[in-house]
Interface confidence: low
Protein backbone atom coordinates (compact mmCIF):
# COMPACT_ATOMS: atom_id res chain seq x y z
CA UNK A 1 0.00 0.00 0.00
CA UNK A 2 1.44 3.64 -0.15
CA UNK A 3 2.90 2.87 -3.71
CA UNK A 4 2.70 4.97 -6.34
CA UNK A 5 2.55 3.13 -9.61
CA UNK A 6 4.52 5.08 -12.31
CA UNK A 7 2.82 5.38 -15.72
CA UNK A 8 4.47 6.04 -18.82
CA UNK A 9 2.91 8.25 -22.06
CA UNK A 10 2.31 6.00 -24.95
CA UNK A 11 1.82 2.48 -25.87
CA UNK A 12 2.32 -0.21 -23.00
CA UNK A 13 3.33 -2.33 -25.64
CA UNK A 14 5.39 -2.88 -28.51
CA UNK A 15 3.13 -5.43 -30.24
CA UNK A 16 -0.56 -5.69 -30.39
CA UNK A 17 -1.74 -8.71 -31.83
CA UNK A 18 -4.54 -9.89 -33.58
CA UNK A 19 -5.98 -13.47 -34.82
CA UNK A 20 -9.01 -13.04 -37.55
CA UNK A 21 -10.74 -15.09 -40.02
CA UNK A 22 -8.75 -15.01 -43.40
CA UNK A 23 -11.79 -12.76 -45.14
CA UNK A 24 -11.54 -9.14 -43.52
CA UNK A 25 -15.01 -7.15 -43.98
CA UNK A 26 -15.33 -3.36 -44.36
CA UNK A 27 -15.87 -1.69 -40.90
CA UNK A 28 -15.05 -4.80 -39.28
CA UNK A 29 -13.63 -4.04 -35.77
CA UNK A 30 -9.85 -5.60 -35.53
CA UNK A 31 -8.44 -5.07 -32.11
CA UNK A 32 -7.72 -1.97 -29.46
CA UNK A 33 -4.80 -0.65 -29.15
CA UNK A 34 -4.22 1.28 -25.52
CA UNK A 35 -2.52 4.35 -25.79
CA UNK A 36 -1.77 5.19 -21.80
CA UNK A 37 -2.66 9.03 -21.43
CA UNK A 38 -1.03 9.44 -18.25
CA UNK A 39 -2.18 12.97 -17.04
CA UNK A 40 -5.37 12.32 -18.89
CA UNK A 41 -5.31 15.76 -20.44
CA UNK A 42 -3.37 14.93 -23.54
CA UNK A 43 -5.80 15.25 -27.32
CA UNK A 44 -4.44 12.28 -29.44
CA UNK A 45 -5.14 11.42 -32.37
CA UNK A 46 -4.21 8.01 -34.58
CA UNK A 47 -3.17 7.56 -37.93
CA UNK A 48 -2.45 4.31 -39.64
CA UNK A 49 0.44 3.68 -41.80
CA UNK A 50 -1.74 1.60 -44.37
CA UNK A 51 -4.79 4.20 -44.44
CA UNK A 52 -6.44 2.67 -47.49
CA UNK A 53 -6.86 -0.69 -45.32
CA UNK A 54 -6.77 0.07 -41.88
CA UNK A 55 -8.17 3.30 -39.59
CA UNK A 56 -8.23 4.05 -36.42
CA UNK A 57 -10.69 5.44 -33.86
CA UNK A 58 -10.55 8.29 -31.20
CA UNK A 59 -10.84 5.40 -29.01
CA UNK A 60 -7.72 3.42 -30.69
CA UNK A 61 -10.32 0.87 -31.97
CA UNK A 62 -8.46 -0.56 -35.66
CA UNK A 63 -10.96 -1.05 -38.25
CA UNK A 64 -10.51 -2.39 -41.77
CA UNK A 65 -11.66 0.25 -44.31
CA UNK A 66 -12.52 -2.17 -46.93
CA UNK A 67 -13.00 -5.51 -47.71
CA UNK A 68 -9.53 -7.71 -48.24
CA UNK A 69 -8.42 -11.28 -47.90
CA UNK A 70 -5.87 -11.38 -44.91
CA UNK A 71 -2.42 -12.01 -46.26
CA UNK A 72 1.26 -11.72 -45.63
CA UNK A 73 1.01 -8.05 -47.27
CA UNK A 74 -1.59 -6.93 -44.56
CA UNK A 75 0.40 -8.85 -42.13
CA UNK A 76 2.19 -6.02 -40.14
CA UNK A 77 1.79 -2.36 -39.81
CA UNK A 78 2.16 0.47 -37.84
CA UNK A 79 -0.16 2.54 -35.37
CA UNK A 80 1.17 6.23 -35.05
CA UNK A 81 -0.63 8.60 -32.09
CA UNK A 82 0.01 12.41 -31.96
CA UNK A 83 -0.74 14.59 -29.45
CA UNK A 84 -2.87 17.25 -31.01
CA UNK A 85 -1.24 20.16 -29.16
CA UNK A 86 2.91 19.25 -28.49
CA UNK A 87 2.95 17.28 -31.67
CA UNK A 88 4.47 14.60 -30.04
CA UNK A 89 4.36 10.83 -31.53
CA UNK A 90 4.57 7.42 -30.79
CA UNK A 91 3.91 4.26 -32.53
CA UNK A 92 3.37 0.81 -32.29
CA UNK A 93 3.41 -2.35 -34.48
CA UNK A 94 0.41 -4.26 -35.30
CA UNK A 95 0.76 -7.74 -36.26
CA UNK A 96 -2.33 -9.91 -37.93
CA UNK A 97 -2.14 -13.28 -38.01
CA UNK A 98 -4.48 -15.75 -39.69
CA UNK A 99 -6.82 -17.91 -37.54
CA UNK A 100 -6.40 -21.35 -38.34
CA UNK A 101 -8.76 -23.25 -40.81
CA UNK A 102 -10.69 -26.38 -39.26
CA UNK A 103 -8.06 -28.42 -40.71
CA UNK A 104 -5.06 -27.04 -39.14
CA UNK A 105 -6.85 -27.17 -36.14
CA UNK A 106 -7.23 -31.09 -36.58
CA UNK A 107 -3.82 -31.31 -37.54
CA UNK A 108 -2.74 -29.61 -34.70
CA UNK A 109 -4.99 -31.44 -32.32
CA UNK A 110 -3.47 -34.33 -33.79
CA UNK A 111 -0.18 -33.39 -32.96
CA UNK A 112 -0.60 -32.46 -29.81
CA UNK A 113 -1.87 -35.91 -28.81
CA UNK A 114 1.33 -37.50 -30.51
CA UNK A 115 3.63 -35.05 -29.12
CA UNK A 116 3.10 -36.93 -25.97
CA UNK A 117 4.64 -39.97 -27.56
CA UNK A 118 7.09 -38.33 -30.54
CA UNK A 119 7.58 -34.88 -28.79
CA UNK A 120 10.75 -34.38 -31.42
CA UNK A 121 8.59 -35.33 -34.35
CA UNK A 122 6.26 -33.22 -33.91
CA UNK A 123 7.23 -30.26 -32.33
CA UNK A 124 7.13 -28.05 -35.58
CA UNK A 125 3.60 -28.01 -35.00
CA UNK A 126 3.71 -26.38 -31.49
CA UNK A 127 3.52 -22.71 -31.27
CA UNK A 128 2.45 -21.90 -34.56
CA UNK A 129 -1.23 -22.49 -34.66
CA UNK A 130 -3.41 -20.92 -32.12
CA UNK A 131 -6.74 -23.06 -31.61
CA UNK A 132 -10.10 -20.82 -31.27
CA UNK A 133 -13.02 -22.13 -30.14
CA UNK A 134 -15.75 -21.71 -32.54
CA UNK B 1 -25.20 -23.39 -29.28
CA UNK B 2 -25.31 -20.67 -31.56
CA UNK B 3 -29.26 -19.87 -32.31
CA UNK B 4 -30.56 -17.19 -34.43
CA UNK B 5 -34.45 -16.85 -34.01
CA UNK B 6 -36.34 -14.47 -36.13
CA UNK B 7 -39.33 -12.79 -35.69
CA UNK B 8 -43.47 -14.11 -36.93
CA UNK B 9 -44.33 -14.29 -40.70
CA UNK B 10 -45.79 -10.82 -41.58
CA UNK B 11 -48.72 -10.13 -44.51
CA UNK B 12 -48.65 -5.86 -45.24
CA UNK B 13 -50.71 -3.87 -47.77
CA UNK B 14 -48.12 -2.23 -50.57
CA UNK B 15 -47.19 1.33 -49.29
CA UNK B 16 -46.78 -0.04 -46.05
CA UNK B 17 -43.03 -0.74 -43.98
CA UNK B 18 -42.15 -4.24 -41.91
CA UNK B 19 -39.05 -4.39 -39.48
CA UNK B 20 -38.00 -8.08 -38.77
CA UNK B 21 -35.93 -9.12 -35.81
CA UNK B 22 -33.41 -11.61 -35.30
CA UNK B 23 -32.49 -12.60 -31.59
CA UNK B 24 -28.78 -13.88 -31.49
CA UNK B 25 -27.72 -16.33 -28.95
CA UNK B 26 -25.02 -18.59 -27.91
CA UNK B 27 -21.82 -16.47 -29.33
CA UNK B 28 -20.76 -12.69 -28.81
CA UNK B 29 -23.15 -10.63 -30.23
CA UNK B 30 -20.83 -8.10 -31.30
CA UNK B 31 -17.98 -10.40 -32.81
CA UNK B 32 -19.42 -10.80 -36.38
CA UNK B 33 -21.19 -9.00 -39.04
CA UNK B 34 -24.76 -10.18 -39.41
CA UNK B 35 -26.40 -10.46 -43.06
CA UNK B 36 -29.89 -9.39 -44.50
CA UNK B 37 -30.90 -12.17 -47.55
CA UNK B 38 -34.33 -12.74 -49.00
CA UNK B 39 -35.54 -15.05 -51.12
CA UNK B 40 -38.73 -14.36 -53.50
CA UNK B 41 -41.89 -17.67 -53.83
CA UNK B 42 -39.65 -20.04 -56.14
CA UNK B 43 -36.08 -17.94 -56.48
CA UNK B 44 -32.88 -17.93 -55.36
CA UNK B 45 -30.83 -16.10 -52.67
CA UNK B 46 -30.07 -12.13 -52.56
CA UNK B 47 -28.07 -10.33 -50.29
CA UNK B 48 -29.57 -7.03 -48.78
CA UNK B 49 -26.62 -6.10 -46.50
CA UNK B 50 -24.95 -6.24 -43.18
CA UNK B 51 -24.84 -4.83 -39.99
CA UNK B 52 -21.87 -4.59 -38.05
CA UNK B 53 -23.34 -4.89 -33.90
CA UNK B 54 -19.96 -3.72 -32.58
CA UNK B 55 -19.95 -0.15 -34.25
CA UNK B 56 -23.59 -0.22 -35.89
CA UNK B 57 -21.76 0.52 -38.84
CA UNK B 58 -24.35 -0.91 -42.07
CA UNK B 59 -23.73 -1.63 -45.86
CA UNK B 60 -26.72 -2.16 -48.35
CA UNK B 61 -27.41 -3.25 -51.39
CA UNK B 62 -27.95 -0.48 -53.68
CA UNK B 63 -31.15 -2.29 -54.71
CA UNK B 64 -32.43 -1.24 -51.39
CA UNK B 65 -30.45 1.72 -50.78
CA UNK B 66 -33.44 4.28 -49.08
CA UNK B 67 -36.15 1.01 -48.26
CA UNK B 68 -33.69 -0.86 -46.08
CA UNK B 69 -32.50 -0.13 -42.63
CA UNK B 70 -30.64 -2.28 -40.10
CA UNK B 71 -30.39 -1.57 -36.74
CA UNK B 72 -29.39 -3.31 -33.50
CA UNK B 73 -30.22 -3.69 -29.65
CA UNK B 74 -27.17 -4.81 -28.04
CA UNK B 75 -28.50 -4.91 -24.90
CA UNK B 76 -30.91 -8.13 -26.53
CA UNK B 77 -28.31 -9.30 -29.02
CA UNK B 78 -31.33 -8.65 -31.37
CA UNK B 79 -30.88 -7.17 -34.96
CA UNK B 80 -33.57 -5.38 -36.90
CA UNK B 81 -34.22 -5.36 -40.57
CA UNK B 82 -36.67 -2.65 -41.72
CA UNK B 83 -38.03 -2.56 -45.55
CA UNK B 84 -40.41 0.00 -46.23
CA UNK B 85 -42.38 1.36 -49.32
CA UNK B 86 -43.28 -2.50 -49.91
CA UNK B 87 -44.40 -3.70 -52.93
CA UNK B 88 -46.13 -7.33 -54.11
CA UNK B 89 -42.07 -7.85 -55.39
CA UNK B 90 -41.14 -7.49 -51.93
CA UNK B 91 -42.99 -11.03 -51.07
CA UNK B 92 -40.69 -13.32 -49.90
CA UNK B 93 -38.91 -14.92 -46.82
CA UNK B 94 -36.26 -13.08 -44.94
CA UNK B 95 -33.28 -14.50 -43.42
CA UNK B 96 -30.70 -13.19 -40.75
CA UNK B 97 -27.43 -14.69 -41.22
CA UNK B 98 -24.13 -14.77 -39.09
CA UNK B 99 -21.56 -16.05 -37.50
CA UNK B 100 -17.11 -16.40 -37.69
CA UNK B 101 -18.31 -17.83 -41.88
CA UNK B 102 -22.22 -16.56 -42.15
CA UNK B 103 -22.65 -19.91 -41.19
CA UNK B 104 -25.42 -19.36 -38.88
CA UNK B 105 -28.86 -18.64 -40.50
CA UNK B 106 -32.09 -17.80 -38.73
CA UNK B 107 -35.23 -19.98 -40.04
CA UNK B 108 -36.58 -17.19 -42.22
CA UNK B 109 -39.77 -14.71 -41.93
CA UNK B 110 -42.11 -15.07 -44.80
CA UNK B 111 -43.17 -11.00 -45.64
CA UNK B 112 -46.42 -11.03 -48.07
CA UNK B 113 -47.13 -8.28 -49.40
CA UNK B 114 -50.70 -7.99 -51.16
CA UNK B 115 -53.92 -5.60 -51.45
CA UNK C 1 -21.59 -5.76 -59.11
CA UNK C 2 -20.16 -9.04 -59.63
CA UNK C 3 -22.58 -11.44 -60.88
CA UNK C 4 -22.03 -14.85 -60.46
CA UNK C 5 -23.38 -17.93 -63.24
CA UNK C 6 -23.62 -21.14 -62.06
CA UNK C 7 -23.78 -24.22 -64.54
CA UNK C 8 -26.02 -26.31 -64.67
CA UNK C 9 -29.20 -24.38 -63.60
CA UNK C 10 -30.30 -28.11 -63.03
CA UNK C 11 -28.88 -31.26 -63.17
CA UNK C 12 -30.58 -35.10 -62.75
CA UNK C 13 -28.12 -37.50 -61.05
CA UNK C 14 -28.33 -41.06 -59.29
CA UNK C 15 -27.04 -41.97 -55.85
CA UNK C 16 -23.25 -43.20 -56.09
CA UNK C 17 -22.84 -40.04 -58.95
CA UNK C 18 -19.76 -37.72 -59.11
CA UNK C 19 -21.15 -34.06 -59.67
CA UNK C 20 -19.36 -30.88 -60.47
CA UNK C 21 -21.01 -27.70 -60.40
CA UNK C 22 -19.17 -24.62 -61.83
CA UNK C 23 -19.65 -20.97 -60.82
CA UNK C 24 -18.12 -18.00 -62.84
CA UNK C 25 -17.99 -14.84 -61.54
CA UNK C 26 -17.83 -12.07 -63.83
CA UNK C 27 -14.34 -10.18 -62.60
CA UNK C 28 -12.36 -11.86 -60.45
CA UNK C 29 -13.01 -12.64 -56.29
CA UNK C 30 -10.76 -14.05 -54.04
CA UNK C 31 -12.54 -16.81 -52.42
CA UNK C 32 -15.87 -18.90 -53.21
CA UNK C 33 -18.27 -20.01 -50.54
CA UNK C 34 -21.01 -22.77 -50.80
CA UNK C 35 -24.56 -23.27 -49.78
CA UNK C 36 -27.03 -26.38 -50.11
CA UNK C 37 -31.01 -25.56 -49.47
CA UNK C 38 -33.56 -27.88 -49.10
CA UNK C 39 -37.18 -26.73 -49.75
CA UNK C 40 -38.81 -24.83 -46.90
CA UNK C 41 -35.24 -24.75 -45.47
CA UNK C 42 -32.72 -21.94 -44.65
CA UNK C 43 -29.49 -21.90 -47.06
CA UNK C 44 -26.89 -24.32 -44.80
CA UNK C 45 -23.03 -23.94 -45.40
CA UNK C 46 -21.29 -26.37 -46.96
CA UNK C 47 -17.57 -24.85 -48.26
CA UNK C 48 -15.98 -21.47 -46.96
CA UNK C 49 -13.00 -19.68 -48.60
CA UNK C 50 -13.23 -21.72 -51.62
CA UNK C 51 -12.42 -25.46 -50.31
CA UNK C 52 -12.33 -25.06 -46.64
CA UNK C 53 -15.09 -28.06 -45.52
CA UNK C 54 -17.57 -26.61 -43.26
CA UNK C 55 -18.48 -28.10 -39.37
CA UNK C 56 -20.18 -31.58 -40.16
CA UNK C 57 -20.58 -31.30 -43.78
CA UNK C 58 -19.30 -34.81 -45.39
CA UNK C 59 -16.02 -35.24 -46.49
CA UNK C 60 -17.55 -35.78 -49.83
CA UNK C 61 -18.40 -32.34 -50.92
CA UNK C 62 -15.08 -30.52 -51.75
CA UNK C 63 -14.30 -26.95 -53.41
CA UNK C 64 -11.63 -25.32 -55.71
CA UNK C 65 -10.71 -22.69 -57.97
CA UNK C 66 -9.73 -19.84 -58.25
CA UNK C 67 -9.90 -16.25 -59.76
CA UNK C 68 -13.39 -16.28 -61.70
CA UNK C 69 -13.98 -20.06 -62.08
CA UNK C 70 -15.20 -22.14 -59.16
CA UNK C 71 -16.48 -25.55 -58.83
CA UNK C 72 -18.10 -27.30 -56.30
CA UNK C 73 -17.49 -31.41 -56.17
CA UNK C 74 -19.92 -33.83 -54.67
CA UNK C 75 -18.06 -37.31 -55.11
CA UNK C 76 -20.48 -39.64 -54.38
CA UNK C 77 -24.02 -38.37 -54.21
CA UNK C 78 -26.68 -39.25 -51.75
CA UNK C 79 -29.86 -39.36 -51.30
CA UNK C 80 -29.94 -36.73 -48.68
CA UNK C 81 -27.51 -33.96 -51.06
CA UNK C 82 -30.29 -33.84 -53.56
CA UNK C 83 -31.09 -30.22 -52.77
CA UNK C 84 -30.53 -26.78 -54.62
CA UNK C 85 -26.81 -25.12 -54.30
CA UNK C 86 -25.49 -21.74 -54.37
CA UNK C 87 -22.24 -20.23 -54.58
CA UNK C 88 -21.78 -16.61 -53.03
CA UNK C 89 -18.76 -14.04 -53.34
CA UNK C 90 -17.93 -12.44 -49.86
CA UNK C 91 -15.17 -9.88 -52.10
CA UNK C 92 -16.93 -6.97 -53.17
CA UNK C 93 -20.07 -5.82 -52.12
CA UNK C 94 -23.01 -6.53 -52.54
CA UNK C 95 -21.91 -9.67 -51.88
CA UNK C 96 -24.00 -11.65 -54.49
CA UNK C 97 -25.25 -15.40 -54.86
CA UNK C 98 -25.34 -17.41 -58.01
CA UNK C 99 -28.66 -18.08 -59.31
CA UNK C 100 -28.63 -21.67 -57.93
CA UNK C 101 -28.16 -25.23 -59.28
CA UNK C 102 -30.87 -27.99 -58.46
CA UNK C 103 -29.83 -31.51 -58.09
CA UNK C 104 -32.85 -33.85 -58.85
CA UNK C 105 -33.01 -37.64 -58.77
CA UNK C 106 -32.54 -38.94 -61.97
Known amino acids: SGEIALCKTGFPEDVYSAVLSKDVHEGQPLLNVKFSNCNGKRKVQYESSEPADFKVDEDGMVYAVRSFPLSSEHAKFLIYAQDKETQEKWQVAVKLSLKPTLTEESVKESAEVEEIVFPRQFSKHSGHLQRQKR | EVQLVESGAEVKKPGASVKVSCKASGYTFTSYLMHWVRQAPGQGLEWMGYINPYIDVTKYNEKFKGRVTMTRDTSTSTVYMELSSLRSEDTAVYYC????????WGQGTLVTVSS | EIVLTQSPSSLSASVGDRVTITCRAS?????MYWYQQKPGKAPKLLIY???NLAPGVPSRFSGSGSGTDFTLTISSLQPEDFATYYC?????????FGQGTKLEIK
Open chain 3, 88 to 96: QQFSSPPFT
Open chain 2, 97 to 104: AGGDYEDY
Open chain 3, 27 to 31: SSVNY
Open chain 3, 49 to 51: YTS
